[in-house]
């Protein structure tokens, strides 16, 4: 007996071939011997089966001795043994229809769990293997669970259902609602304008919610809310903003914030949260601001940085076109009685310059 696997909602062709390539009598019946369809003269006739309105056959293939039955909009309960009677012989085809669905909405927040449930006909014992867009393999039986969704789980999941050495493939589109980056750091010289961008890792037809940026300045004892905003159909509107600093926010996505000036008192780290309508939980993105200041006071040339820097970052002062350099894995470096010329303050990570500031030292006569 031939076994054919089908997908719920899909269309399947059950083949039945006669030895002679000519138009002949044929009938398709179910396991209860109820006629589904057949031929009477040149007419396709339908029987009393509940399948009849979804069953069809291709007249153009009858001349080739092919009397297939096509079943549209498959249901789990269509799983049955179907009998094709042609040329005084009977061909049996066992059809097994499976369905695979996500238990919840397929738009899930990062960190939430995903459960896929397999619908299968009674008496079947299928196995399921799913592969995430990032290449993660998960196996299961009637259910498959992914406890904590990550950004890279967004996309098309491919699940293979196996039964009797046959397979059928399901594709399920999962959207993980998250920002493109978990964290980002902006490096700026004192006085420069700061641009913070928070691109989303997904697109939705309608995007509505509300958000807030909390800021913990390095110099401050507690964090404070810098801005709150609403999002309606991808349009951003500011609800409340602090007076110091007076942030500006873009009206369109991606979420975009502008700080007019980078100042040492603003250096620190922030947490932007976004709560989406009809979703439990919030999206988060951490943002850091590192500010550099180079100053000369009397005989002392100083370079300082404020904000969250890793201990492996190097701060250097060097005289342009000269070998004179002072470097430290610290947040401040200085040179006493510096030579006249253009000095560069550099913040670097393994040789890669993250931030630089130039200061001119004039000769003192």
């Amino acid at each position: 007996k031939k076994v054919v696997l089908g997908k719920k909602g899909d269309t399947v062709e059950l083949t039945c071939n006669a030895s002679q390539k000519k138009n002949t009598q044929f009938h398709w019946k179910n396991s209860n011997q109820i006629k589904i369809l057949g031929i009477q003269g040149l007419f396709l006739t339908k029987g009393p089966s509940k399948l009849s309105d979804r069953a069809d056959s291709r007249k153009s293939l009858w001349d080739q001795g092919c009397f297939s039955m096509i079943i549209k909009n498959l249901k789990i309960e269509d799983s049955d043994t179907y009998i094709c009677e042609v040329e005084n012989k009977k061909e049996e085809v066992e059809l097994l229809v499976f369905g695979l669905t996500a238990n919840s909405d397929t738009h899930l927040l990062e960190g939430q769990s995903l459960t896929l449930t397999l619908e299968s006909p009674p008496g079947s014992s299928p196995s399921v293997k799913c592969r995430s867009p990032g290449g993660k393999n998960i196996q299961g039986g009637r259910t498959i669970s992914v406890p904590q969704l990550e950004r890279q789980d967004s996309g098309t999941w491919t699940c293979t259902v196996s039964q009797d050495q046959k397979t059928v493939e399901f594709k399920i589109d999962i959207v993980v609602l998250a920002f493109q980056k978990a964290s980002s750091t902006v490096y700026k010289k004192e006085g420069e304008q700061v641009e913070f961008s928070f691109p989303l890792a997904f697109t939705l037809e309608k995007l509505t919610g509300s958000g807030e940026l909390w800021w913990q300045a390095e110099r401050a004892s507690s964090s404070k809310s810098w801005i709150t905003f609403d999002l309606k159909n991808k349009e951003v509107s500011v609800k409340r903003v602090t007076q110091d600093p007076k942030l500006q926010m873009g009206k369109k996505l991606p979420l975009h914030l502008t700080l007019p000036q980078a100042l040492p008192q603003y250096a620190g780290s922030g947490n932007l949260t976004l709560a989406l309508e009809a979703k439990t939980g919030k999206l988060h993105q951490e943002v850091n601001l590192v500010v550099m200041r180079a100053t000369q006071f009397q005989e002392n040339l100083t370079c300082e940085v404020w904000g969250p820097t890793s201990p492996k970052l190097t701060l250097s002062l060097k005289l342009e076109n000269k070998g004179a350099t002072v470097s430290k894995q610290a947040k401040a470096v200085w040179v006493l009685n510096p030579e006249a010329g253009m000095w560069q303050c550099l913040l670097s990570d393994s040789g890669q310059v993250l931030l630089e500031s130039n200061i001119k030292v004039v000769p003192t006569w």
């Epitope: 269309t11 399947v12 062709e13 007419f43 069809d56 007249k59 096509i70």
Partner: antibody, heavy 115, light 107 residues
Amino acid sequence: QVQLQQWGAGLLKPSETLSLTCAVYGGSFSGYYWSWIRQSPGKGLEWIGEINQSGSTNYNPSLKSRVTISVDTSKNQFSLKLSSVTAADTAVYYCARVINWFDSWGQGTLVTVSS
Amino acid sequence: DIQMTQSPSSVSASVGDRVTITCRASQGISSWLAWYQQKPGKAPKLLIYAASSFQSGVPSRFSGSGSGTDFTLTISSLQTEDFATYYCQQANSFPYTFGQGTRLEIK
């Protein structure tokens, strides 16, 4: 609701090979046959050929020697290649879904053969 | 190949008129016939299949009849949106063939 979206080169020189692809969105790819049909002012609607998910093909005998229809089930796409084109192959080419009747069609691609 | 011949090749009518288009097959095709409507710059749209069955969403003013070699498409009361070209197609045997079309114009 099934949607068929087709694309391919619109301007060819005589003797070149016409190449078109049709992608199927939002419906079942299995169980159906996927056809190519062309329409020219001179010959009206002309069925070129068809393919199913398994790669089984049927072609119009008048074009069979020049036609190849192939399928990529991983992408729910099927393609048409028509070799050694002449000005007589200038037409609007359509992809369509069929069991016995063409119930869903692509938007059509005008292919012009000119030296 | 089965030849499909439509008549008339064009017809002029007014809104509200009853219009009949015929299609003749060069050999018997039982009821393996479909009717399509095509508007300029668009793909054909299936109206009637199996000679007399309605495709979903098709208005009831369209009807099909016939069997064997002679078939008819009738529009009981013409609407503005019905002015188009109509084609018949046989699904009895390969190669599938179409009629040459009937152009329905506003009088």
